[in-house]
Interface confidence: low
């Protein structure tokens, strides 16, 4: 089901708007994939759940409210304040954990962006031309990454020399979309939490 369009207040924490757009875009893309790939295992029950960010980022730990994380780390996150250059924070002074949380989200988005772009390049070679990634979803990922980061980093596309297996690619697309939707929900909750704090 499509999520309702939220119209943010002009003064709202800027990344909340982007995260709402992201959640809506990935939900729409997942719905489209389920419908288009109806004869593929693409439902939440059928797929193997895989987290491409595992061991690379710590978004869930870093983004828990500070009250929950204060005893989690051997380093005291409350004693030291930090400033990042990410535009989502505007000129806010923020705790290290908040900066780390936003950085972890950025890293997640970057990893998914690489995977999605690589996958889209393969899907474009499919003679059936059955499904492609929604350009709006890719654009929304890009927008949120830019909002999180003043100094834009170029995201490399992974090159693949072997002949793509389109069946496997479509199954992987479903796996990635399911995982990314869960991450998008987390990101949206974090941004809502930061907007409220």
């Amino acid at each position: 089901r499509n999520l309702p369009v939220a119209t943010p207040d002009p003064g709202m924490f800027p990344c909340l708007h982007h995260s709402q757009n992201l959640l809506r875009a990935v939900s729409n893309m997942l719905q489209k994939a389920r419908q288009t790939l109806e004869f593929y295992p693409c439902t939440s029950e059928e797929i193997d759940h895989e987290d491409i960010t595992k061991d690379k980022t710590s978004t869930v730990e870093a983004c828990l409210p500070l009250e929950l994380t204060k005893n989690e780390s051997c380093l005291n996150s409350r004693e030291t304040s930090f400033i990042t250059n990410g535009s989502c924070l505007a000129s806010r002074k923020t705790s290290f954990m908040m900066a780390l949380c936003l950085s972890s989200i950025y890293e997640d988005l970057k990893m998914y962006q690489v995977e999605f772009k690589t996958m889209n390049a393969k899907l474009l070679m499919d003679p059936k031309r059955q499904i492609f990634l929604d350009q709006n979803m890719l654009a929304v990922i890009d927008e949120l990454m830019q909002a999180l980061n003043f100094n834009s980093e170029t995201v490399p596309q992974k090159s693949s020399l072997e002949e793509p297996d389109f069946y496997k690619t479509k199954i992987k697309l479903c796996i990635l979309l399911h995982a990314f939707r869960i991450r998008a929900v987390t990101i949206d909750r974090v941004m809502s939490y930061l907007n409220a704090s």
């Epitope: 780390s73 950025y106 970057k110 980061n149 980093e153 170029t154």
Partner: nanobody
Framework: EVQLVESGGGLVQPGGSLRLSCAAS????????MSWVRQAPGKGLEWVSF????????SYADSVEGRFTISRDNAKNTLYLHMNSLKPEDTAVYYC???????????RGQGTQVTVSS
């Protein structure tokens, strides 16, 4: 096997500068955020700074903000910490860490000693 080797520490007078380096190997350096943490004599670990995998996002402790600059060269698999206007309270062993800088999750090097004294 993950290896992080820090260098560049030493004895410096207050107001002086140092550049710490951390040579990384055994993992895809460009895929990970990196951090510097430090441990002053008789104190616990303190986060100093972190930098995102591509170098675009960085963050600093209040105590070093405006004096220290973190950077990285992904082509050389090296992390840096440029330290200016050093103070006696910056005296510590500085460790380079892979990831968020929390020892539950991350590897860290053997450290390099920085002593600020006249």
């Amino acid at each position: 096997e993950v290896q992080l080797v820090e260098s560049g520490g030493g004895l410096v007078q207050p107001g002086g500068s140092l550049r710490l380096s951390c040579a990384a190997s055994g993992f895809t350096f460009s895929s990970y955020m990196m951090s510097w943490v430090r441990q002053a004599p008789g104190k616990g670990l303190e986060w100093v700074s972190f930098i995102s995998s591509g170098g675009g996002i960085s963050s600093y402790a209040d105590s070093v903000e405006g004096r220290f600059t973190i950077s990285r060269d992904n082509a050389k698999n090296t992390l840096y910490l440029h330290m200016n206007s050093l103070k006696p309270e910056d005296t510590a062993v500085y460790y380079c860490t892979k990831g968020r800088g929390d020892t539950r999750y991350d590897y860290r090097g053997q450290g390099t000693q920085v002593t600020v004294s006249s």
